[in-house]
């Protein structure tokens, strides 16, 4: 019924300079993508390739060990969160290529863009759980010897996933498709209609629960851990610090643009120039956040090479050593052998 070529629009239009002469058609619908969108497409493509392959490999390596190895449980869940988010990328990629036209329907609009938010919350909650685990290993080694088991780890992961789903619901509910009259285009986005306060509330909750609060707690948590481990001669290592900083910092660095633009847009009028500028950068911010979905496997490999000192080791074997090594629960050594586990703090969100 609607036989439009969305990739190469060809529509006459009234001059947007608000001239009084509406008799002159102006074809200003550009066939070329904006620079931020092109950058977003490049990032999406790289993230998809690395994220799908890397996380699939991590899932494969950790799945066999997840029944008995707690670290494997953490990494398995993080990889699943990332892998799920990467599956939405071809759809988002296609939409940007078609000038943000969304031909996939209302259900896909609600579900697919929400995956990256689910990933954000799942990852940060899993990171919080992993951080708590690392903290307990250092400060409560006896408790860990008695109670730290695979069953409890799975329960903690289930709670993290449940909370993540709960926190994703508002964005899921407010996602709608809007079909524009001219040029003909179906857009997928959030619509709060008149309720600007609700929009702000969602943005603030996302910023606090998905960014600021985790930033604060992880910073405090790892400050204590590092202070304790540095006080022991055997574990004093700049490499440990670098890994911890890389893992935690990357999560917050890649989420920062999305969170900042999101909060700003919720306080701006949709017709304001700043809002329109930020809206043009939206895809780029999302793609930047999506880097979180592929960076964990990269960190694991880099760290694995560093700690194993075997650059020629096969990738699955290298990952297995990094991801499934069980922490030794002796206070003086608790951080030494499980340093790489802290990479689980690196999480992805949107």
């Amino acid at each position: 019924m609607n036989s439009f070529n969305y990739t190469t629009p060809d529509y006459g239009h009234y001059d947007d300079k608000d001239t009084l002469d509406l008799n002159t058609p102006v074809d200003k619908t550009s066939n070329t993508l904006r620079v931020p969108d092109i950058l977003a497409l490049v990032i999406f493509a790289v993230v998809f390739l690395v994220g799908v392959l890397g996380n699939a490999l991590v899932v494969w390596v950790t799945a066999f060990e997840a029944k008995r190895t707690i670290n494997a449980i953490w990494f398995l869940n993080l990889a699943v969160a990332d892998f799920l988010s990467c599956l939405a990328l071809p759809i988002l990629f296609t939409s940007i290529v078609q000038h943000h036209h969304w031909p996939f329907g209302g259900a896909a609009c609600s579900i697919l863009p929400s995956l990256i938010l689910l990933n954000m919350y799942a990852s940060i909650l899993l990171l919080a759980t992993i951080s708590a685990d690392r903290f307990l290993l250092v400060f409560k080694p006896i408790w860990c010897q008695n109670f730290r088991g695979a069953g409890l780890a799975w329960i903690a992961c289930a709670v993290a996933w449940g909370l993540a789903l709960l926190l994703t619901i508002p964005s899921f509910l407010y996602r709608v498709v809007r079909e524009e009259y001219f040029p003909p285009k179906v857009l997928c986005g959030v619509d709060y209609s008149h309720d600007k306060r609700r929009e702000r509330a969602v943005a603030i909750v996302r910023l606090v629960l998905g960014f600021l609060w985790p930033l604060l707690t992880l910073t405090i948590c790892y400050t204590f851990i590092l202070l304790r481990t540095w006080s022991r001669r055997a574990t004093r290592s700049t490499k440990t610090l670098k890994v911890v900083v890389a893992v935690v910092a990357s999560f917050f660095i890649f989420w920062l643009p999305y969170q900042v633009t999101g909060i700003m847009m919720s306080f701006l009028e949709p017709s304001s120039p700043t809002f329109l500028l930020l809206n043009k950068l939206d895809s780029l911010c999302v793609s930047f956040a999506y880097i979180n979905c592929c960076i964990n496997p990269i960190i694991y490999v880099v760290a694995g090479q560093g700690f194993q000192g075997r650059l020629r080791k096969s990738l699955p074997s290298l990952l297995r050593n990094v991801l499934t090594e069980e922490s030794v629960v002796r206070e003086s050594k608790s951080f030494t052998r499980s340093t790489v586990d802290t990479m689980a703090q690196k999480t992805q969100a949107v």
């Epitope: 036989s3 060809d10 239009h13 608000d18 509406l22 008799n23 524009e180 003909p184 619509d191 017709s271």
Partner: antibody
């Protein structure tokens, strides 16, 4: 100047079909949508849909998708609307109007009366 | 569909008075381009509607400057600074941001 000249009034029986025309002049016919609007007696305006002569794109309001069929003849710069299976509720004035933005130019309207 | 709610439905005025018609949409009318496609039409008895104001506040060619439009997002207003005899008729607001294009129920401007 832009002109939209519509065909004359129609008196039809329930269940029949009617086809009305809208001859456009004074602008490049293929550059703009041709929209159609219904106005029942003493009531507001209802958008039926548009036809885009440039690429044959057509869009109907959900309410009219089984009632109206929009076509154009580019060679004569004329737009057509056919209404099917007419009922008494279809009695109204039907306007063609140049679209793609605000409806800046309208035809004079075609009165359709459905009567047994 | 976007519902356009016009108030009042009838507006009795005296010639020379100022008149104000309100139009509220059920959703934001801001287009992805940043434009707001809210327009005002006047229909006199036995005539086709005529475009007065397009994109919230722009007067169409030939429309006197006593007509002005304002608003943003979901709330819009048409003002006539000094009502003249030729201004009497039914005023419709309309949005062409989203499909389907929708119109308000109309406001009849009549003499007291």
């Amino acid at each position: 100047q832009v002109q939209l000249q519509q065909s004359g009034p129609e008196l039809v029986k329930p269940g029949e079909s009617v086809k009305m025309s809208c001859k456009a002049s004074g602008y490049t016919f293929t550059d703009y949508y041709m929209d159609w609007v219904k106005q029942s007696h003493g009531k507001s305006l209802e958008w039926i849909g548009y036809f885009y002569p440039n690429n044959g794109g057509v869009k109907y309001s959900q309410k009219f998708k089984d009632k109206a069929a929009l076509t154009v003849d580019k060679s004569s710069t004329t737009a057509y609307m056919e209404l099917h299976s007419l009922t008494f509720e279809d009695s109204a004035v039907y306007y063609c109007t140049r679209g793609s933005g605000p409806f800046a130019y309208w035809g004079q309207g075609t009165l359709v009366t459905v009567s047994a | 569909d976007i519902v356009m709610t016009q108030t009042p439905l009838s507006l009795p005025v005296s010639l020379g008075d100022q008149a104000s018609i309100s139009c509220r949409s059920s959703q934001s009318l801001v287009h992805s381009s940043g434009n707001t496609y809210l327009h005002w039409y006047l229909q006199k008895p036995g005539q086709s509607p005529k475009l007065l104001i397009y994109k919230v506040s722009n007067r169409f060619s030939g429309v006197p400057d006593r007509f002005s439009g304002s608003g943003s997002g979901t709330d819009f207003t048409l003002r006539i600074s000094r009502v003249a005899a030729e201004d009497l008729g039914v005023y419709f607001c309309s949005q062409s941001t989203l499909v389907p294009v929708t119109f308000g129920a109309g406001t009849e401007l009549e003499l007291k």
